[in-house]
Amino acid sequence: AVDLTLLANLRLTDPQRFFLTCVSGEAGAGRGSDAWGPPLLLEKDDRIVRTPPGPPLRLARNGSHQVTLRGFSKPSDLVGVFSCVGGAGARRTRVIYVHNSPGAHLLPDKVTHTVNKGDTAVLSARVHKEKQTDVIWKSNGSYFYTLDWHEAQDGRFLLQLPNVQPPSSGIYSATYLEASPLGSAFFRLIVRGCGAGRWGPGCTKECPGCLHGGVCHDHDGECVCPPGFTGTRCEQACREGRFGQSCQEQCPGISGCRGLTFCLPDPYGCSCGSGWRGSQCQEACAPGHFGADCRLQCQCQNGGTCDRFSGCVCPSGWHGVHCEKSDRIPQILNMASELEFNLETMPRINCAAAGNPFPVRGSIELRKPDGTVLLSTKAIVEPEKTTAEFEVPRLVLADSGFWECRVSTSGGQDSRRFKVNVKVPPVPLAAPRLLTKQSRQLVVSPLVSFSGDGPISTVRLHYRPQDSTMDWSTIVVDPSENVTLMNLRPKTGYSVRVQLSRPGEGGEGAWGPPTLMTTDCPEPLLQPWLEGWHVEGTDRLRVSWSLPLVPGPLVGDGFLLRLWDGTRGQERRENVSSPQARTALLTGLTPGTHYQLDVQLYHCTLLGPASPPAHVLLPPSGPPAPRHLHAQALSDSEIQLTWKHPEALPGPISKYVVEVQVAGGAGDPLWIDVDRPEETSTIIRGLNASTRYLFRMRASIQGLGDWSNTVEESTLGNGLQAEGPVQESRAAEEGLDQ
């Protein structure tokens, strides 16, 4: 069973001092990561017993294995059902505590009732404050039965449940009609899935005979021991004030376990700690009684004395539960109550015995759950004991269960049952997860779900290049941490697998499924610099850059140009997908904007160092385009352009700019300024004869405006080759007069 205890502090004079604590003795309890088990949960369950809403309860975690619920403000906050959930996977277990109001009309004689399948359960509600109305019994919040108030027997209302079955389990309550539900008596009925002394599917297996009030679990046959007892059969008492499956926990406070209710996994339920009894667990056991709720009687023989926590304390020369066994009878010594081995291992098990006559090797035997008897391979004889060593054949899962060491001499015999747990080494069910990658390293999460048994002691990560026949590289890591695989090859696929191990010899599990993880490209290392930039318009910018010359091929797929508009907090990114490119035209920019510009080389998804930034101010948006542009050849080297001023000007034009381009030519266009803005005509001179030209123009106020329509015109023929176009400007009217 899961080592989970829910403690309720029953000092009820002040609800603010009341607390519930859930303690787990499980390895790795409450660590909270998916692979190693969810955390402990402690909460009030309002599904059946609803109480008025109050301030939320406070949950405090103390390390990984303890959680405490506080913040109760009034007595009604305490009434109802509380549950603690712990353990991982199939071992996830819920422990339930039912709290009754000490001032209720009806009080349970006994809150927890654990019965066997087919038994008759009797719930008894004692009258604390009488009302002359019906008593309504409910099961899990639904109506179950009615009793007339005259039907009380000796001041108690009894509910008899004959032939109970597991579905009858749950929370029962007895309430006077018309009374507040908080005045009810609340009970918990636990019905074991088997008849008395049996467990397992079909209830075919025999329980180990739990001592000291331990209850046999109907699924696994283990004894759920009362608080303060330990061992496979609960045969050993803990020291006063201790509890937990291995007596590893200590009751808080100076008065030990006084005033505490202990709730354990079903089918145990709840009780006071060992040595205490009463509805608030504050009364010490009467003489001759001991154990949880003082339910056990000592009946010590041969001068033994009764200790209310542990039972009979035997004088020298005697042992046994009632000091009924003479020390002359052989006795198994210090046998562990539980042993754990991994599947397919061949462990050695030791069994020590003493007695008079002295036990010898042949008088000690080991019996497996299937009845097979093993004889010891060697024995170590010491003055006070003989230790027999047994070599166990390769373990299979069916070897899980109760083994028995038995010693027989002419003085009598003794046997000690102990539990052997055969654990299955863990095997990952999934491949590890890639978290991040670089060119020479991979960061991997090895935490995966697994089949088999925990806890996980080590995680091995095996990896090698894909399609490689070389040996696997292995790294051993802490189960809870991510792993970085270093010194890998860039742009290479690696096969990665996880291997999990649990404690003990043979605890290594099979390798999990492989997964392919690929390292990134090499990072580009070259830093470009900006050679220059040229404003081609209010929203266009031509940028050029260079790279340092280095030997070998260029590591890069292209360039990323970044323009940062600090005023608007916006970034523009332009991808240049050729690593040979050294210039780019950026369009669609915002006129009148101050940009910070840089360029980076990229390779795959990796960016190299950015160039030192440049600061570029785009001119504000200019005026509309000039209208009705017209070209007229005047000679073999001159063409006259005429136009009309743009409409709706935002201010006075400072100049016009004419663009001249040979039609079909590959060269850059030529820009010529017309510095007299009042002009509506200009002559472009120095052109080549018999050549077709394209012209367009735009005005400038604070910034350049939109381009006009493009016009075509050819110079007249047979002139000499000119040196290049120039312009002469005059008013349109004057040109026409000439």
Partner: antibody
Framework: EVQLLESGGGLVQPGGSLRLSCAAS????????MHWVRQAPGKGLEWVSV????????YYADSVKGRFTISRDNSKNTLYLQMNSLRAEDTAVYYC????????????WGQGTLVTVSS | NIQMTQSPATLSLSPGERATLSCRAS??????LAWYQQKPGQVPRLLIY???NRATGIPARFSGSGSGTDFTLTISRLEPEDFAVYYC?????????FGQGTKVEIK
């Protein structure tokens, strides 16, 4: 489906006796309080008697006390009303009714059986 | 014994109208009151319990109110199938007692 089916009504002379039965099905009969309620022709409803789930406690209206006896057989899921010393004013349709979960109101009623006391 | 008095004895209304039925207890019964509907030749049917809670399957046009000694059953818009006799019943103490009934008939 919850069903209650009364039987045993009929014509009886004053001073005579009759035993009514109510067969229950569709629910756990042994958990519920059961009642008899009657309705004289053209008149309103009148509560007659109640019996607790265990059968250990019964109550009666003053008008029938000492003459009528309510009982139940939980193994047969049947409710009974033994009526002795019948009077003309006992003429009515007799209904058995289930009390909802110890609450006091009736969530299921039988179809009724007519008892006529006349000479 | 607690006496239950219903008024009026008869209520003549048209479909679509609002019906208000009254029930008075001779002493306080808290909210321990149920209302039943009975049509000719049929068995009583539970409408309301605990003075104001609608029973399963009862339309929302039926509502109950009151506590102590005075209680009301309201049918917000009468449907043709609502014309019947209505009884109140107290279950605050034994013996259980019913009102004499209110007949809701078509005007």
């Amino acid at each position: 489906e919850v069903q209650l089916l009364e039987s045993g009504g009929g014509l009886v002379q004053p001073g005579g006796s009759l035993r009514l039965s109510c067969a229950a099905s569709g629910f756990t009969f042994s958990k519920y309080k059961m009642h008899w309620v009657r309705q004289a022709p053209g008149k309103g409803l009148e509560w007659v008697s109640v019996i607790y789930p265990s059968g250990g406690k019964t109550y009666y209206a003053d008008s029938v006390k000492g003459r009528f006896t309510i009982s139940r057989d939980n193994s047969k899921n049947t409710l009974y009303l033994q009526m002795n010393s019948l009077r003309a004013e006992d003429t009515a349709v007799y209904y058995c009714a289930r009390e909802m979960g110890g609450s006091g109101w009736y969530d299921y009623w039988g179809q009724g059986t007519l008892v006529t006391v006349s000479s | 014994n607690i006496q239950m008095t219903q008024s009026p004895a008869t209520l003549s209304l048209s479909p679509g109208e609002r019906a208000t039925l009254s029930c008075r207890a001779s002493q306080s019964i808290s909210s321990y009151l149920a209302w039943y509907q009975q049509k000719p030749g049929q068995v009583p049917r539970l409408l309301i319990y605990d003075a104001s809670n609608r029973a399963t399957g009862i339309p929302a046009r039926f509502s109950g109110s009151g506590s102590g000694t005075d209680f009301t059953l309201t049918i917000s818009r009468l449907e043709p199938e609502d014309f019947a006799v209505y009884y109140c019943q107290q279950y605050g103490s034994l013996p259980r007692t019913f009102g004499q009934g209110t007949k809701v008939e078509i005007k």
